[in-house]
Interface confidence: medium
């Protein structure tokens, strides 16, 4: 099941995805796509990085973190209800069936209409589980309760792969090390 993230119409949505390069500059290609991860690649690609840079992107989709350090989390700017759905982050470690894929569910809620300006403490009271993160433009939000889940999901998935399929050697060979613990 996908980890769920939430944002309001007009805000920026944040979908986390990380890996740890073996060394600075030893990047692994990554793609983001709209829709669940297919067998290979990403469907409906919205952003792609290669071994050096972001080489494809579409408007409103960008990487706010330092992708050269493995933070390939996707920011979607000024979301609308149409942005709801599953997104695929695929870390494309070269090799046969060697990539790591994560499906993240984005839920967009209609913006709250308020008759008068809302003080900050009222906003906090109204949305106790929302966290405003760093970024530019409208506030990026995500559900606090789901923050640990993606890490646990990733660690669990990767730990199984590393233990059972002996991907540790493959990851080392391919120049990527996904550190666990």
């Amino acid at each position: 099941s996908e980890v769920e993230y939430r944002a309001e119409v007009g805000q920026n949505a944040y979908l986390p995805c990380f890996y740890t390069p073996a060394a600075p500059g030893n990047l692994v290609p990554v793609c983001w796509g709209k829709g669940a991860c297919p067998v290979f690649e990403c469907g409906n690609v919205v952003l792609r990085t290669d071994e050096r840079d972001v080489n494809y992107w579409t408007s409103r989709y960008w990487l706010n973190g330092d992708f050269r350090k493995g933070d390939v989390s996707l920011t979607i700017e000024n979301v609308t209800l149409a942005d709801s759905g599953i997104y695929c982050c695929r870390i494309q470690i070269p090799g046969i069936m060697n990539d790591e894929k994560f499906n993240l569910k984005l839920v967009i809620k209609p913006a709250k209409v308020t008759p008068a300006p809302t003080r900050q403490r009222d906003f906090t009271a109204a949305f106790p589980r929302m966290l405003t993160t760093r970024g530019h433009g409208p506030a990026e939000t995500q559900t606090l309760g789901s923050l640990p889940d993606i890490n646990l999901t990733q660690i669990s998935t990767l730990a199984n792969e590393l233990r059972d399929s002996r991907l540790a050697n493959d990851l080392r060979d391919s120049g990527a090390t996904i550190r666990i613990g």
């Epitope: 290979f40 046969i96 069936m97 894929k101 792969e161 059972d164 399929s165 991907l167 493959d170 391919s174």
Partner: antibody
Framework: QMQLQQSGGGLVQPGGSLRLSCAAS????????MSWVRQALGKGLEWVSG????????YYADSVKGRFTISRDNSKNTLYLQMNSLRAEDTAVYYC???????????WGQGTLVTVSS | EIVMTQSPDSLAVSLGERATINCKSS????????????LAWYQQKPGQPPKLLIY???TRESGVPDRFSGSGSGTDFTLTISSLQAEDVAVYYC?????????FGQGTRLEIK
């Protein structure tokens, strides 16, 4: 010595089903990624399906997606390919293969012929 | 997907002579972070499964005679048999394992002239 012993091929009518087996000896299938590759008579090699070492990820060629299912039974140290809704173009010799690391195929089964014909 | 194209489709070489088979990929299979080419060569004799000869484009598999060698980088690769022996008559395939789906060249049939 590592070996892959295949069985389960045969003649089947279009729309029918078959299950291919690939019994491993000399290594445990749960420790390695495994694949199925096929070869039509007189033609080249075509990758069909694969399963990751953990068994958590399965992969299929577009030509068989939704019809074929790869799986394995760790207790029997055996890899399987369940083939449903078979078509004439699925006629081929099917090979199972062990993947070393996440790279190349280092051991292959002897192959088993699947013929889809009415 | 990455398309692998071999040339020639068939080749006839005299015993003891050099045989050269080429393989071209539609995109690079060189991963710059580890400087490895994700390409392998296989030999297939009639009625037998393929046999791994070369991996990482130039690393000979254990037990493969040293007359077999692989070279090339990026998108262009070559399998060379330095001195053809009768037992080398077979079909040879290149294969990329850089990204899915795994793809093979169409094969090159090697015969004795």
């Amino acid at each position: 010595q590592m070996q892959l012993q295949q069985s389960g091929g045969g003649l089947v009518q279009p729309g029918g089903s078959l299950r291919l087996s690939c019994a491993a000896s000399g290594f445990t299938v749960s420790s390695y990624a495994m694949s199925w590759v096929r070869q039509a008579l007189g033609k080249g090699l075509e990758w069909v399906s694969g399963i990751s070492g953990s068994g958590g990820s399965t992969y299929y060629a577009d030509s068989v997606k939704g019809r074929f299912t790869i799986s394995r039974d760790n207790s029997k140290n055996t890899l399987y390919l369940q083939m449903n809704s078979l078509r004439a173009e699925d006629t081929a010799v099917y090979y199972c293969a062990k993947i070393v690391g996440a790279t190349h195929f280092d051991y292959w089964g002897q192959g088993t012929l699947v013929t889809v014909s009415s | 997907e990455i398309v692998m194209t071999q040339s020639p489709d068939s080749l006839a070489v005299s015993l003891g002579e050099r045989a050269t088979i080429n393989c071209k990929s539609s995109q690079s299979v060189l991963y710059s972070s580890n400087n490895k080419n994700y390409l392998a060569w296989y030999q297939q004799k009639p009625g037998q499964p393929p046999k791994l000869l070369i991996y990482w484009a130039s690393t000979r598999e254990s037990g493969v005679p040293d007359r077999f060698s692989g070279s090339g980088s990026g998108t262009d690769f070559t399998l060379t048999i330095s001195s053809l022996q009768a037992e080398d008559v077979a079909v040879y395939y290149c294969q990329q394992y850089y990204s899915g789906p795994i793809t093979f060249g169409q094969g090159t049939r090697l015969e004795i002239k």
